[in-house]
Interface confidence: low
């Protein structure tokens, strides 16, 4: 098993650009989530999903969209990149 695969590793965007961060897991996990970590702060939940077709907002969903069409994939889309979205992003999955 590859576990959780997140791409790209690095990305530079101009303000206003949109992009998608891909996240896939091959462990048949139902729960998947996206977090952001800013300097000096802990992980903050952006969006999460408890199963295919089900998504919900976390603490900081502003400016992001997610979809969960399959159990394996949980892409995070930055709708219109802003300086405030400069961060390190983590995807996670669990049973």
């Amino acid at each position: 098993n590859a576990g959780v695969t997140q791409t790209p590793k690095f990305q530079v965007l101009k303000t206003g650009q949109s992009m998608t961060l891909q996240c896939a897991q091959d462990m048949n996990h139902e729960y998947m989530s996206w977090y952001r970590q800013d300097p000096g702060m802990g992980l903050r939940l952006i969006h999460y999903s408890v199963g295919a077709g089900i998504t919900d907002q976390g603490e900081v969903p502003n400016g992001y969209n997610v979809s969960r069409s399959t159990t394996e994939d949980f892409p995070l889309r930055l709708l219109s990149a802003a300086p405030s979205q400069t961060s390190v992003y983590f995807c996670a999955s669990s049973y």
Epitope: Q57, S80, S84
Partner: antibody
Framework: QVQLVQSGAEVKKPGSSVKVSCKAS????????IHWVRQAPGQGLEWMGE????????KYNEKFKGRVTITADTSTSTAYMELSSLRSEDTAVYYC????????????WGQGTTVTVSS | DIQMTQSPSFLSASVGDRVTITCKAS??????VVWHQQKPGKAPKALIY???HRYSGVPSRFSGSGSGTEFTLTISSLQPEDFATYFC?????????FGQGTKLEIK
């Protein structure tokens, strides 16, 4: 720091319209949502609608649909809320509020604009 | 629409008291609840978001908890500046809705 400064008090006649402005500063105007909420005298808070300047997306409370129009001028970082066909029960303090942490969490509030509808 | 019902509507307490305000949602809203404080003649101020997360600058005596349909705001030791009206707000679905408010008065 984030500031939302609203236009001054208005007195309007029944049947007329009012347009309230909300000028934002201290953050990137196109990045965060602007909401409009009203509070009638001695009453609770009532959400009217929201606007995302970054995309132009608008959502209205069905209760106000057809009577409320939310717009913005990104060049001046100003949002507007226009309410038409005013009646006495529209007498209230109207607030704009900005969402930073989440689409629909009202983090920052303007000082409020009192609108009085009276013949 | 999701109804948010707060209790009590009025609460008399003394400086130093521990007080708890409850908010019940008419349907499951997850943790998508915010607590606001409003002083007379002033705009509301957000205190707690996502049920239990304090905003920067909000004193630690304020805490929130709950998920699903029942939420609480607790002030561990009332200070004179805490006497105000408190509103809960759900952001699970549109239209966004608020509780009717709890007015916290000095006993």
């Amino acid at each position: 720091q984030v500031q939302l400064v609203q236009s001054g008090a208005e007195v309007k006649k029944p049947g007329s319209s009012v347009k309230v402005s909300c000028k934002a500063s201290g953050y990137s105007f196109t990045t965060y949502y602007i909401h409009w909420v009203r509070q009638a005298p001695g009453q609770g808070l009532e959400w009217m609608g929201e606007f995302f300047p970054g995309s132009g997306n608008i959502k209205y409370n069905e209760k106000f649909k057809g009577r409320v129009t939310i717009t913005a001028d990104t060049s001046t970082s100003t949002a507007y809320m226009e309410l038409s066909s005013l009646r006495s029960e529209d007498t209230a303090v109207y607030y704009c509020a900005g969402s930073y942490y989440s689409y629909d969490v009202l983090d920052y509030w303007g000082q409020g604009t009192t609108v009085t509808v009276s013949s | 629409d999701i109804q948010m019902t707060q209790s009590p509507s009025f609460l008399s307490a003394s400086v130093g008291d521990r007080v708890t305000i409850t908010c019940k949602a008419s349907q499951n809203v997850g943790i998508n609840v915010v607590w606001h404080q409003q002083k007379p003649g002033k705009a509301p101020k957000a205190l707690i978001y996502s049920s239990s997360h304090r905003y920067s600058g909000v004193p630690s005596r304020f805490s929130g908890s709950g998920s699903g349909t029942e939420f609480t705001l607790t002030i561990s030791s009332l200070q004179p500046e805490d006497f105000a009206t408190y509103f809960c707000q759900q952001f699970k679905s549109y239209p966004l809705t608020f509780g009717q408010g709890t007015k916290l008065e000095i006993k």
